[in-house]
């Protein structure tokens, strides 16, 4: 209808990187940009994804590096992490959330894709990272291992070959674990501390290095309360579990003192694995009972999983597995469960801003049913699993549903700020649900919408649109875009008009009648009023169209609700040559050429376009006649 | 050779002080225990206090807690026995006693014993 | 706290006499007890620790076993100089806490 499609600014990147994959106009003190999202960006080695901001009338578009942003006390991986893949801006304050949906950092042998976003200022710094599903991982740990160096142990080399291989099963890392080794005998040395080295090799490298200091007394109590009030005290971090491992070959020549030390060690949560070295005994034939029930005493509360005793120095190597299992007993999920919570969440798969925060998607949560997070200046909200089960049953579970497909919210009159929430594979058809979310980790489901067609995807793209501008939704349009008619991938956009409280299903928009693929839906825009008659408008991408060059479609808003024929189809053949996916992501909320009319910018494979609005004129024909 | 000598025993009135010392000669007092074991005149053995010399923790008989506290000086190889609030009751031979590993902790030396005597 | 019983409270026998005096733990309690003798006026002595352990310097007439929460301390063949007050102590395992019996007196026929 008025969008120029004669002179459109083809902004070019990265076809590799998926640039335009997302796009978002911004303003910064009347400049304006567009922010373009590229998930497949690389940033040295790794295919990061990144965020570039792009200035509109002419010039490069610069990358913001947000693919460098590192979390501390992690360790991370960024590879193939989809930054850009969302990106929502906040009008408020004209700063933007660019979502890494598949940042992943290391817990063990696992890799836990948590996903993380990065909040970027209105000038384009980074400010914060929004990470609401990380979580510690279950190896936050601080081990101290009291290894007894007096003269009685023989050989040392022994020693030292067990706490090597025991080192090497450690994971040891940002986030994960820290180990320090104090030696004790009369006396009692710190060999190395809890955050002198950072990495397997390191640790090794630093343990091989060991020498036994000797000695001819064996306080063990000595050894272990110095490790509590010391070794764990220098360099150990707040909230990780502590685990103390103690390597001694006789009875303590302090036992009288194990009682308090051990009741100190229990105050302060220090676990306790405790090896008995018989060794000694064995070579003198002597009876170990009393040296076993003082190690049994110091090894935490159940023996049969704190304790172990070994023959002789040399049989230390016989016990590294079944020791190391026993302290990572607690990897993989929490209590042992069979199923994931949060760990391969994948937040930030969308993004939609409120007043008092964001809503980021969570399509991996709860076994990939998904869920919907918040995060506020206050703090996190994360629903429980079973705050879903109204609309998501347990006989379910297994399917998929990938709840926070897509995230946006409504507003009523009667109920305020809901949320929605798409989950496109829901029981095959997919399904839409309107929520609150309230701070006990509980959800009121409103509503729900759902799909009519397997595979169609229905719920994967959700707009809301307030036609009118008086800050109450009039119309939810809901995408399915894979929704099959005609022997094709067609694409569909369901409308549901408020109804008082309840959003009423009043038909879909019409697209074009190719026989090709479209994929109508992808993508679904509430856009400020294009044609200026005062009602807000829509618009609609069709990425697949004319053979995967794309199509974008304007609606427009009138009275209250949403004309259902296009007004106008723009196709990428008609703007530029070579556009490719045209139509995968939509965003118009602001003049960009100070002409005082709302212009669009649109996604396509390896580009940004913006189009610009044309001025409509209104002419008012009258007809009189004279002589009357 | 191991040797402790008891000295600071007296005649001290109820709710008076006193302060006991065990020196050590032959052996570290920080590689062992020092206990306090007192003898009323005609009882038995009752055990007062003990003290970790290296790690100064310390036990006490629920009769002398919060009244008497024991302490060590492994410079000086000495250990103490601060009694206040003292009672009739307290009335005895204080002997220090050595507790350590080699004798499967049991009391190997004693001191000679110093008398205390609380009255008015 | 652990409570060592110690019975008799005195005895009368001769010289040659086989003499048994008992100790009872009021609960289980581990190896960990000795016997003293103690003569008037005198400090105690250490005879038996690790409840049959002989200390050095100690004639082998004295001997000590334990049969679950009894320990027992014979004399086989009392001497004269034999004729004292003997007590049994039970340490606490893993602190020094400890505890005494209430004393045997083996006094002469």
């Known amino acids: 209808f008025n969008m120029d499609t004669r002179k459109p600014r083809v902004i070019p990147g990265s076809r590799t990187a998926f640039f335009g994959y997302t796009v978002q106009q911004h303003d910064i003190s009347g400049n304006k940009w567009l922010v373009v999202g590229a998930p497949l960006e690389t940033n040295g080695y790794q295919k990061t994804g990144d965020v570039y901001k792009c200035p509109v009338i002419h010039g490069n578009c610069t990358k913001l590096n947000l693919g460098r942003v590192t979390l501390s006390n992690v360790s991370e991986r960024k590879d193939n992490m989809r930054l850009g893949l969302s990106l929502a801006t906040n009008p408020k304050d004209n700063s933007f959330l660019a979502c890494s949906p598949l940042w992943s950092h290391e817990c063990g042998s696992s890799y836990y894709t948590t996903g993380m976003c990065s909040r970027v200022n209105s000038n384009f710094r980074f400010s914060k990272t929004v990470a609401p599903a990380l979580q510690r991982c279950q190896t936050y740990m601080d081990i101290v291992i009291v290894l007894d160096g007096s003269n009685s142990i023989y050989p040392w080399v022994e020693v030292q070959h067990f706490l090597i291989n025991i080192l090497k099963k450690f994971y040891i890392g940002p986030g994960q674990i820290q180990v320090g080794v104090v030696q004790y005998g009369e006396d009692v040395v710190h060999e190395f501390h809890l955050n002198d080295y950072r990495s397997v090799k390191d640790v090794v490298e630093a343990a091989s290095h060991i020498e036994q200091r000797g000695g001819t007394e064996t306080r063990t109590a000595f050894g272990i309360e110095f490790a509590r009030s010391e070794a764990f005290q220098k360099g150990g971090r707040k909230g990780a579990k502590k685990v103390m491992i103690v390597i001694t070959d006789g009875e303590s020549h302090d036992s009288p003192d194990l009682e308090k030390v051990i009741q100190q060690s229990e105050r302060d949560n220090v676990t306790r694995y405790a090896v008995a070295v018989l060794g000694y005994y064995n070579r003198r034939g002597i009876n170990p009972e009393t040296f076993l029930n003082e190690i049994k005493y110091i090894a935490s509360d159940p023996d049969d999983k704190h304790f172990f005793n070994v023959t002789d120095e040399a049989a230390l190597k016989d016990i590294v597995d079944a020791l190391g299992d026993r302290i990572f007993s607690l990897e993989g999920t929490n209590k042992n469960e069979t199923s994931f919570g949060l760990e391969m969440s994948q937040t930030g798969f969308s993004s939609h801003v409120v007043e008092d925060g964001v809503l980021l998607g969570a399509v991996g949560a709860y076994d990939w049913n998904g869920a919907v997070l918040k995060e506020t200046s206050a703090g996190k909200v994360i629903p429980l699993r079973e705050s879903y089960l109204k609309e998501f049953p347990e006989e379910l579970k297994n399917h998929g549903a990938y709840l926070g497909y897509t995230v946006t919210s409504v507003v009523s009159s009667r109920q305020g700020r809901v949320y929605v929430a798409g989950a496109p594979r829901f029981n095959h058809t997919g399904k839409v649900i309107l929520f609150t979310m309230h701070n006990n980790r509980s959800l009121t489901i409103h509503q729900a919408m759902r799909g009519q067609q397997i595979g169609s995807y229905f719920g994967s793209e959700i707009t809301s649109v307030d036609i009118d501008g008086d800050g109450v939704t009039d119309v939810l349009l809901v995408g399915a875009p894979m929704y099959f008619n005609e022997g094709r991938e067609r694409g569909k956009v369901y409308v549901y008009e408020l109804r008082q409280n309840l959003f009423v299903y009043n038909g879909t928009l019409k697209d074009s009648h190719s026989y090709q693929n479209a994929r109508f839906g992808s993508s679904i825009a509430s856009v400020r009023d294009l044609n200026q008659d005062s009602y807000n408008d829509v618009v609609v991408g069709a990425p697949l169209e004319d053979n995967h060059a794309g199509a974008i479609y304007i609606f427009h808003g009138f009275r209250g609700s949403i004309l259902k024929t296009p007004k106008q189809r723009i196709t990428a053949s008609e703007l530029a040559t070579g556009l490719q996916y045209f139509g995968c992501s939509i965003h118009g909320q602001l003049d960009l050429n100070e002409d005082g009319l709302i212009d669009l910018a649109v996604g396509a494979l390896g580009n940004a376009v913006i189009l610009w609005s044309r001025p409509v004129v209104q002419i008012n024909a009258s007809l009189h006649f004279e002589p009357s | 050779e191991v040797q402790l000598v008891e000295s600071g025993g007296g005649l001290v009135q109820p709710g008076g002080s006193l302060r006991l010392s065990c020196a050590a000669s032959?052996?570290?007092?920080?590689?062992?225990?020092i206990h306090w074991v007192r003898q009323a005149p005609g009882k038995g053995l009752e055990w007062v206090a003990s003290i970790s010399s290296h790690s100064s923790y310390t036990y006490y008989a629920d009769s002398v807690k919060g009244r008497f506290t024991i302490s060590a000086d492994t410079s000086k190889n000495t250990a103490y026995l601060q009694m206040n609030s003292l009672r009739a009751e307290d009335t005895a031979v204080y002997y220090c006693?050595?507790?350590?590993?080699?004798?499967?902790?049991?009391?190997?030396?004693w001191g000679q014993g110093t008398l205390v005597t609380v009255s008015s | 706290d652990i409570q060592m019983t110690q019975s008799p409270s005195s005895l009368s026998a001769s010289v040659g006499d086989r003499v048994t005096i008992t100790c009872r733990a009021s609960q289980s309690v581990s190896s960990a007890v000795a016997w003293y003798q103690q003569k008037p006026g005198k400090a105690p002595k250490l005879l038996i620790y690790?409840?049959?352990s002989l200390y050095s310097g100690v004639p082998s007439r004295f001997s000590g076993s334990r049969s679950g929460t009894d320990f027992t301390l014979t004399i086989s063949s009392l001497q004269p100089e034999d004729f004292a007050t003997y007590y049994c102590q039970q340490s606490a395992p893993y602190s020094s806490l400890i505890t005494f019996g209430q004393g045997t007196k083996v006094e002469i026929k």
């Open positions: 690790s409840a049959s």
């Open positions: 006693a050595r507790y350590w590993y080699q004798s499967a902790w049991a009391l190997d030396y």
């Open positions: 032959g052996f570290n007092l920080y590689s062992s225990y």
